[in-house]
Interface confidence: low
């Protein structure tokens, strides 16, 4: 803690300005009124204070607002935000999206810090759900944000917010997360025509069930292999050779390069070799002619 000392004569700060960068730490503590600092926080960011000086300014605000800073101060913290601990941030009540944006801007280009994670958590919990504008903002700053949420947290995302999601925002999502997001996306995009619908739903298809994939196969969508490889294995397995051929269109040739990888490998094992041969790709590993195909899932259910 900075030692309490009287402010030298003539050094009392009348406003927050450049002259303060020449103050020693103890002079800042003694000569800058916390209330003045709070009302002129927007000026702090434009002044090249040292990290040590910022520590003093933070200390003054902490003394003035022991229960947590008001939003009027938080919005103008600027680089002082980087001095905040998650414990400090947990005391805040941030409701304005503009405040959130201002603080995310400070951390822009860096990995999500514990401070930012806490800030986002406080903000989202305060709003009660991840609305479209919030999601738009968060994914713009952190493309991986959506995939950092648990399936339970994702369940609070309203379908209308799905419009804000870009393909790269889903890159790191696992199947459990896509299972939650896919039905929301399906609902959000339900009024679009076939080709437009596929463009929008494509990124979410890792959560699609078999029946939806079958429906897509009837719509000339020409799914690319990158999307196909992200589909749920259990959703792909029941598809027939004809359905996969229709689903992939001209991209069906890509199956050959992926024949050793899931879900293609597992799908091949479930198809009759005769049917696979009709693709003319040289796919091997199907069920030989004359063999009886048992529905193993039914067998397990009965046993």
């Amino acid at each position: 803690e900075v030692e309490k000392t009287a402010c030298p004569s003539g050094k009392k700060a009348r406003e927050i300005d450049e002259s303060l960068i020449f103050y020693k730490k103890w002079e800042l503590e003694a000569c800058v009124d916390a209330a003045l600092l709070a009302t002129q926080m927007d000026r702090v960011n434009a002044i090249p204070f040292t990290y040590e000086q910022l520590d003093v300014l933070k200390h003054k605000l902490d003394e003035l607002y022991p229960q947590g800073y008001p939003e009027s101060v938080i919005q103008h913290l600027g680089y002082l935000f980087l001095k905040m601990s998650p414990e400090d941030i947990r005391k805040w009540n941030v409701t304005s999206l503009e405040t959130l944006k201002a603080l995310l801007e400070v951390n822009k280009g860096h990995e999500m810090s514990p401070q930012v994670a806490t800030l986002i958590d406080r903000f989202v919990k305060g709003r009660g759900q991840l609305d479209k504008d919030t999601l738009d903002t968060l994914t713009a700053f952190y493309p991986g944000y959506l995939c950092s949420l648990s399936p339970e947290e994702l369940s609070s995302v309203p379908p209308s917010s799905i419009w804000a999601v870009r393909p790269q925002d889903l890159d790191t999502c696992d199947p459990r997360q896509l299972d939650v997001l896919y039905p929301k996306a399906r609902l959000a995009f339900q009024n679009m025509n076939g080709s437009e619908y596929f463009v929008k739903i494509q990124s979410f298809l890792g959560g699609a069930p078999t029946e939806d994939l079958k429906a897509l196969s009837q719509q000339n969508v020409s799914m690319d292999l990158a999307t196909f490889m992200k589909l749920r294995t259990d959703a792909v397995l029941p598809l027939t050779v004809a359905e996969v051929q229709k689903l992939l269109g001209p991209h069906v040739e890509g199956l050959k390069a992926e024949e050793r990888h899931r879900p293609v490998r597992d799908w091949i094992l479930r198809q009759r070799q005769d049917d696979l041969d009709t693709l003319g790709l040289g796919l091997q590993g199907g069920i030989p002619n004359g063999y009886l195909v048992l529905d193993l899932s039914m067998q397990e259910a009965l046993s």
């Epitope: 990995e111 493309p143 991986g144 870009r166 393909p167 790269q168 890159d171 790191t172 080709s195 437009e196 463009v199 929008k200 494509q202 690319d224 292999l225 990158a226 999307t227 490889m229 992200k230």
Partner: antibody, heavy 116, light 107 residues
Framework: EVQLVESGGGLVQPGESLRLSCAAT????????MHWVRQGPGKGLVWVSR????????VYADSVKGRFTISRDNAKNTLFLQMNSLRAEDTAVYYC?????????WGQGTLVTVSS | DIQMTQSPSSLSASVGDRVTITCRAS??????LTWYQRKPEKAPKSLIY???SLQSGVPSRFSGSGSGTDFTLTISSLQPEDFATYYC?????????FGQGAKLEIK
């Protein structure tokens, strides 16, 4: 500061192999998708391959499929491109880049020349 | 594959000029487009993503617009350091594809 440094380029004959490396520093390598992009002499940029953060998913351009293999060693913060059956048309400067669809950081590149 | 076509392939301009480069996709790519600046012997630099969002640290004289198949990169007032080659790239689907480049030279 994010840094990507490619190495392993050189002059080889058609049909030979080469392995390129990309050493990454200044960021958590294991969290990011990585790409290889090339630029032939007097030509534009051409995407070659992509690998996801844990190395379980890879994608290739048709022109290199079956000949090139992208891989990574997250413990050593290094990206690789194994190039087999090289052809004259593979002559280019090869860049590694960080990002998903958008490549926000690039290395300076390493020159691969395939000539007899 | 999605083809990306840029125009013009080269253009001459003076410092202070407003310059526009266009990029056309062979099919609808929504807003999944990014622009790069490339200087000789330097690594490409990402300028704009999602068709119109400015990358951190990129001057505001650069702007992007468009969606679907037609996109534009605009430099509102050319600076000496802006003379370079500019590439568009789609990231809607693999394989990722670039435009052939637009070389911006001093008049």
């Amino acid at each position: 500061e994010v840094q990507l440094v490619e190495s392993g380029g050189g002059l080889v004959q058609p049909g030979e192999s080469l392995r390129l490396s990309c050493a990454a520093t200044g960021f958590t390598f294991s969290s990011y998708w990585m790409h290889w992009v090339r630029q032939g002499p007097g030509k534009g940029l051409v995407w070659v391959s992509r690998i996801n953060s844990d190395g379980t998913s890879t994608v290739y351009a048709d022109s290199v499929k079956g000949r090139f293999t992208i891989s990574r060693d997250n413990a050593k913060n290094t990206l690789f491109l194994q190039m087999n059956s090289l052809r004259a048309e593979d002559t280019a400067v090869y860049y590694c880049a960080r990002g998903r669809g958008i490549m926000t950081y690039w290395g300076q590149g390493t020159l691969v020349t395939v000539s007899s | 594959d999605i083809q990306m076509t840029q125009s013009p392939s080269s253009l001459s301009a003076s410092v202070g000029d407003r310059v526009t480069i266009t990029c056309r996709a062979s099919q609808d790519i929504g807003s999944w487009l990014t622009w790069y600046q490339r200087k000789p012997e330097k690594a490409p630099k990402s300028l704009i993503y999602a068709a119109s969002s400015l990358q951190s640290g990129v001057p505001s004289r650069f702007s992007g617009s468009g969606s679907g198949t037609d996109f534009t990169l605009t430099i509102s007032s050319l600076q000496p350091e802006d003379f370079a080659t500019y590439y568009c790239q789609q990231y809607k689907s693999y394989p990722l594809t670039f435009g052939q480049g637009a070389k911006l030279e001093i008049k």
